[in-house]
């Protein structure tokens, strides 16, 4: 069975989270995609979304979040720049497919942002200093207000978790890895 993994990223204030969500391109290439935060016990909140229909490799910026949908590669790239401690939380990518419920993508991202010198990412790896230059053509897309009540979460596990999803069942099993990926400032 495919496992929905919850990856933990430990970053410093000022750094950039740079992640990707993959999808079945034959089914979802031009579908509208969104980046959501999941607060304990609440419905997921949409922070940014692509245009509808989603445009290929056309960056959409909403505040400090940049989404870039690579239709031809079946990948949604998500960047959160200039991270703040209050950005810490659990995030997910979803695909809007009205009137059906949003389709959740792999993987969920547990982001932990700590104060400190942003030049030193987690782990013992060093990353190059980098200020993202956002293309002037970025646009802001309007996101649907629709959120599925079925995606309300219970308090998710505090550690990284593997979520096994045979059919529609969800089984949580704790694992302990933390991903400290060197991510740019």
């Amino acid at each position: 069975a495919t496992k929905l993994t919850e990856e933990k990223y430990e970053l410093k204030e000022g750094q950039t989270l740079d992640v990707k969500c993959d999808y079945t391109l034959e089914k979802f290439a031009s579908s509208q995609k969104a980046w959501q935060i999941i607060r304990d016990g609440e419905m997921p909140k949409t922070l940014a979304c692509t245009e509808r229909p989603s445009k290929n490799s056309h960056p959409v910026q909403v505040g400090r979040i940049i989404l870039e949908d690579y239709h031809d590669h079946g990948l949604l790239r998500v960047r959160m720049v200039n991270l703040q401690v209050e950005d810490s939380g659990l995030y997910q990518c979803v695909i809007y497919q009205p009137p059906k419920e949003p389709h959740m993508l792999f993987d969920r991202i547990r982001l932990v942002v700590t104060k400190g010198f942003s030049g030193t990412p987690g782990s013992n790896e060093n990353s190059t200093q980098n200020v993202y230059k956002i293309p002037p053509t970025t646009t802001k897309a309007l996101c649907p207000l629709y959120t599925s009540p079925r995606t309300v979460t219970q308090a998710p596990p505090k550690s990284t978790a593997d979520v096994s999803t045979p059919d529609s069942e969800i089984n949580l099993t704790n694992v302990t890895d933390i991903i400290r990926v060197p991510v740019f400032n």
């Epitope: 495919t2 993994t5 740079d18 990948l75 991202i109 190059t128 991903i179």
Partner: antibody, heavy 122, light 107 residues
């Protein structure tokens, strides 16, 4: 140890298909992307596409769309790349390479198979 | 697609020499640049990721620098075992693209 072991050399006729395998060991197969890169004799490196072994989702460059199929069998930690409608210019060494974590925008290849030579000749 | 232009395409240097290879991207790649070494008949090997980070186990004579569109790969003191072709690779945008390679030979 941590390695990617590829299947042996193949000789194919134009119009045929070839399926190359890449068996991973020494790490959690489903946590890292598998990429396919090819190299024609005396030429440079050409990225073909990627596979997320966990979700099974794949992406290919425009050049190979419709001709390449990337799959995996997680029970045996093996990824496959099938290229169809072969032509003489597909003669090359095909490499599988481990990418970054499946969720990270980290496209560097820190582990490579030894390569599989595919010769297309009538 | 982002084009990666490497120069020179080949060079010959003496053991102990400082060797410099450049890689130019057709647009800003936000420091998403890696360098690989490929010895004859072998698979490529990652040397440097994200412009300047040395992969574990890679000798410190190899280094990388640059930003924006212009990047440099340096071997501070060329050794006989460094005979190989070196490639840069960008991953700021898909598709991933490699430079054409620089073949390094010993005089």
């Amino acid at each position: 140890q941590v390695q990617l072991v590829q299947s042996g050399a193949e000789v194919k006729k134009p119009g045929a298909s070839v399926k190359v395998s890449c068996k991973a060991s020494g790490y959690t197969f489903t946590r890292y992307d598998i990429n396919w890169v090819r190299q024609a004799t005396g030429q440079g490196l050409e990225w073909m596409g990627w596979l997320n072994p966990n979700s099974g989702n794949t992406g290919q460059t425009q050049k190979f769309r419709g001709r390449v199929t990337m799959t995996r069998d997680t029970s045996i930690n093996t990824a496959y790349m099938e290229l169809s409608s072969l032509r003489s210019e597909d003669t090359a060494v095909y490499y599988c390479a481990r990418g970054g974590y499946t969720s990270a925008w980290r496209w560097y290849f820190d582990l490579w198979g030894r390569g599989t030579l595919v010769t297309v000749s009538s | 697609d982002i084009q990666m232009t490497q120069s020179p395409s080949s060079l010959s240097a003496s053991v102990g020499d400082r060797v410099t290879i450049t890689c130019q991207a057709s647009q800003d790649i936000n420091n998403h640049l890696n360098w690989y070494q490929q010895k004859p008949g072998k698979a490529p090997k990652l040397l440097i990721y994200d412009v300047s980070n040395l992969e574990t186990g890679v000798p410190s004579r190899f280094s990388g620098s640059g930003s924006g569109t212009d990047f440099t790969f340096t071997i501070s003191s060329l050794q006989p075992e460094d005979i190989a072709t070196y490639y840069c690779q960008q991953y700021d945008k898909l598709p991933l693209t490699f430079g054409g390679g620089t073949k390094v030979e010993i005089k």
